[in-house]
Interface confidence: medium
């Protein structure tokens, strides 16, 4: 059954930028992910990046850098500077589009106790939805 | 306002083959999967597959595979179900749904179309 | 393919009364979803994602379940409510559909 993992990690040399990883375990084809923040996109949350496999990849601040790191993982980095740059306990959430199962969606956030530079591995996070 | 509207009823005999078509209107075409769900007389419903408009890829029912084609015409908005083979038990109402969404939040089938009757009969 | 089995395949209630539809999974879904279909008309989905109501759908429908086991609860019947209703997982392909539950006035 497919399902969504998501990783936060705070990066050691600057402390207030994060990289935020998120995979899908899947059959489905990825028609597209969507990263946000403060909650799921479309119920609260913000959008900060959407990564479409062929029409490219679109980010909004304080998103720096958004890329593709396999077929069914991306990887986000956040800027860590100004009114917008997230804290410790900010939530994000993925979203993959499946073709044609639909979408399938986990949060995650900083590990309450983890050290610059360090994270939890990236294990499955519940699925909020799967439409 | 959304809306799917699917070609009108068909009788075909055993072997053909049938095309039913879906014209959406309402909302942007290539956001929107479709799929096709079948319905025999006083039977459930039973999925036969869905299409990505934006792309034309496509996902079939096992069951189906080598008999439903499923195209898509972006320039007039309008879906197409082709079934070949035709046998009796094919004798149902066809109904294309407007799938999930990829840019707004959750949907799951929210528009159907009216469903097309098609008699398979010699 | 996973097979939901719906139960009872009719359940006779009156209005006002409380309805209590089950889904049975073959094997483990994330989530289920339910359509209710009126003679002659097309599905409507009701419940998405388990425990979602959909647009325009009202406060007396809710869903809960995991795992195999779903079930769609109708607080109090209106006399709209008496139709079939089916379940749907999305979760392993082919998408399947319970054979449904017939509402019917007692």
């Known amino acids: 059954t497919p399902e969504v993992w998501v990783q936060v990690r705070m990066e050691a040399t600057e402390l207030s930028s994060f990289t935020i990883r998120c995979g899908f375990l899947g059959s489905g084809s990825i028609s597209l992910v969507t990263v946000s923040w403060g909650g799921p996109n479309g119920a609260g949350g913000t959008t900060l990046a959407v990564l479409h496999p062929e029409r490219g990849i679109r980010q909004w601040a304080p998103a720096r850098q958004a890329r593709w790191e396999t077929q069914s993982s991306i990887s986000l980095i956040l800027e860590g500077s100004g009114a917008s740059s997230p804290c410790a306990n900010t939530t994000f959430c993925c979203k993959f589009a499946s073709f044609p199962e639909g979408s399938w969606e986990a949060c995650g956030s900083l590990p309450p106790s983890s050290d610059p530079g360090l994270s939890a591995p990236p294990t499955p996070a519940p699925i909020l939805r799967a439409d | 306002e959304v809306q799917l509207v699917q070609s009108g009823a068909e009788v075909k005999k055993p072997g053909a083959s049938v095309k039913v078509s879906c014209k959406a209107s309402?909302?942007?075409?290539?956001?929107?999967?479709i799929y096709w769900v079948r319905q025999a007389p006083g039977q459930g419903l039973e999925w036969m597959g869905t299409i990505d408009t934006s792309d034309a890829k496509t996902s079939y029912n096992q069951k189906f595979r080598g008999r439903v084609t499923m195209t898509r015409d972006t320039s007039t908005s309008t879906v197409y179900m082709e079934l070949s083979s035709l046998r009796s038990e094919d004798t149902a109402v066809y109904y294309c749904?407007?799938?999930?969404?990829?840019?707004?939040?959750?949907?799951?089938?929210?528009?159907w179309g009216q469903g097309t009757l098609v008699t398979v009969s010699s | 393919q996973i097979v939901l089995t719906q139960s009872p395949a009719t359940l006779s209630l009156s209005p006002g009364e409380r309805a209590t539809l089950s889904c049975s999974a073959g094997s483990s879904v994330n989530y289920m979803h339910w359509f209710q279909q009126k003679p002659g008309q097309a599905p409507r989905l009701l419940i998405y994602s388990t425990s979602n109501l959909a647009s325009g759908v009202p406060a007396r429908f809710s869903g809960s379940g995991s795992g195999t086991d779903y079930t769609l609860t109708i607080s109090s019947l209106e006399p709209e409510d008496f139709a079939v209703y089916y379940c749907q997982q999305r979760s392993s392909l082919p998408f399947t559909f319970g054979q449904g539950t017939k509402l019917e006035i007692k």
């Open positions: 309402g909302y942007t075409f290539t956001d929107y999967w």
């Open positions: 749904a407007r799938d999930f969404i990829i840019t707004v939040n959750y949907p799951v089938v929210d528009y």
